[in-house]
């Protein structure tokens, strides 16, 4: 099976060839394809924790407008996971977006 | 049609440091990674990097890690690359390279013109 | 890193002659390869990734095989537009590395 940080190269062999996640994407592993990081910011979150090859960003909701002093705050807001919004490739075995000429005339 | 543009030919001091742009146009700019490669003269091709303007995500060749930042900015569909302690052997043309967008693979489908870098005193 | 070692480094040849150029990775690649074409003064045209699979217009004259370690990509009728310095590329690991090129010359 693809590890951590790589995807399969053939959705029909999966794990035979595996190849590393593009910039900006992370897998698990496991044979999952690559996904964009979530970008917190973007997202109007924190980063929590940096995404790396083979996990996404962990964000947390930015914190409320400060109305009372810092010492009476509650507890920092709970981190949560943001789903990226758009899966790379955008389907491991649907149509390719680039046309593919196969020697021999197969499709 | 799709189409990367480049800068013109920088001459620069060792020490300095340059910086290198790649107009995209004809595509979505922040749906494919953008990476940059450089061809000294009359020698082969070196990878530097690569970064993904969605969410600017990077990934760099080590032997460059330290020395080149790559950037984009996503209103002006536009990839920076930035060189710095610049030496003579980092003479050479510097092309931004488009991804393939057709699945996993890991090759450029789409070239800019190269922009000529010389470094001399 | 993956060292890709292309033969020859240059060779003549005359238009409709078959033309071989072999790439030999330092470590198993799978069908993780790509082939591009360049010309004096101008930037790298893909032709063939995962080993085989053309690129789109490029014609069919052009054919990649191979998987591994050992790659070729062959010119069946080679064409006055072909003469060409031809350079195969690795993407099964980072750093993407290329071979040191192939000069097709007119004999």
């Known amino acids: 099976r693809c590890r951590a940080g790589t995807q399969p190269l053939d959705s029909y062999k999966p794990g035979v060839d595996c190849a590393p996640c593009p910039p900006g994407h992370f897998s698990p592993g496991d044979n999952q394809a690559c996904k964009p990081w979530t970008n917190c910011t973007l997202a109007g979150k924190h980063t929590l924790q940096p995404a790396s090859n083979s996990s996404d960003a962990i964000c947390e909701d930015r914190d409320p407008p400060a109305t009372q002093p810092q010492e009476t705050q509650g507890p920092p807001a709970r981190p949560i996971t943001v789903q990226p919004t758009e899966a790379w490739p955008r389907t491991s075995q649907g149509p390719s977006t680039r046309p593919v000429e196969v020697p021999g005339g197969r499709a | 049609q799709v189409q990367l543009v480049q800068s013109g030919a920088e001459v620069k001091k060792p020490g300095s440091s340059v910086k290198v742009s790649c107009k995209a146009s004809g595509y979505t700019f922040k749906d494919y990674t953008m990476h940059w490669v450089r061809q000294a003269p009359g020698q082969g091709l070196e990878w530097i990097g690569g970064?993904?303007?969605?969410?600017?995500?990077?990934t760099y060749n080590q032997n460059f890690k330290d020395r080149a930042t790559l950037t984009v900015d996503k209103s002006t569909s536009t990839a920076y690359m930035e060189l710095s302690s610049l030496r003579s052997e980092d003479t050479a043309v510097y092309y931004c390279a488009r991804m393939g967008y057709h699945g996993p693979h890991l090759d450029f489908d789409v070239w800019g013109q190269g922009t000529t870098v010389t470094v001399s005193s | 890193d993956i060292q890709m070692t292309q033969s020859p480094s240059s060779l003549s040849a005359s238009v409709g002659d078959r033309v071989t150029i072999t790439c030999k990775a330092s470590?198993?690649?799978?069908?993780?390869v790509a082939w591009y074409q360049q010309k004096p003064g101008k930037a790298p045209k893909l032709l063939i990734y995962w080993a085989s699979t053309r690129h789109t217009g490029v014609p069919s004259r052009f054919s990649g095989s191979g998987s591994g370690t050992d790659f070729t990509l062959t010119i069946s009728s080679l064409q006055p537009e072909d003469f060409a310095t031809y350079y195969c590329?690795?993407?099964?690991?980072?750093?993407?590395?290329f071979g040191g090129g192939t000069k097709v010359e007119i004999k």
């Open positions: 590329q690795q993407y099964i690991n980072y750093p993407l590395t």
């Open positions: 970064i993904y303007p969605n969410n600017g995500g990077s």
């Open positions: 470590q198993d690649v799978g069908a993780a």
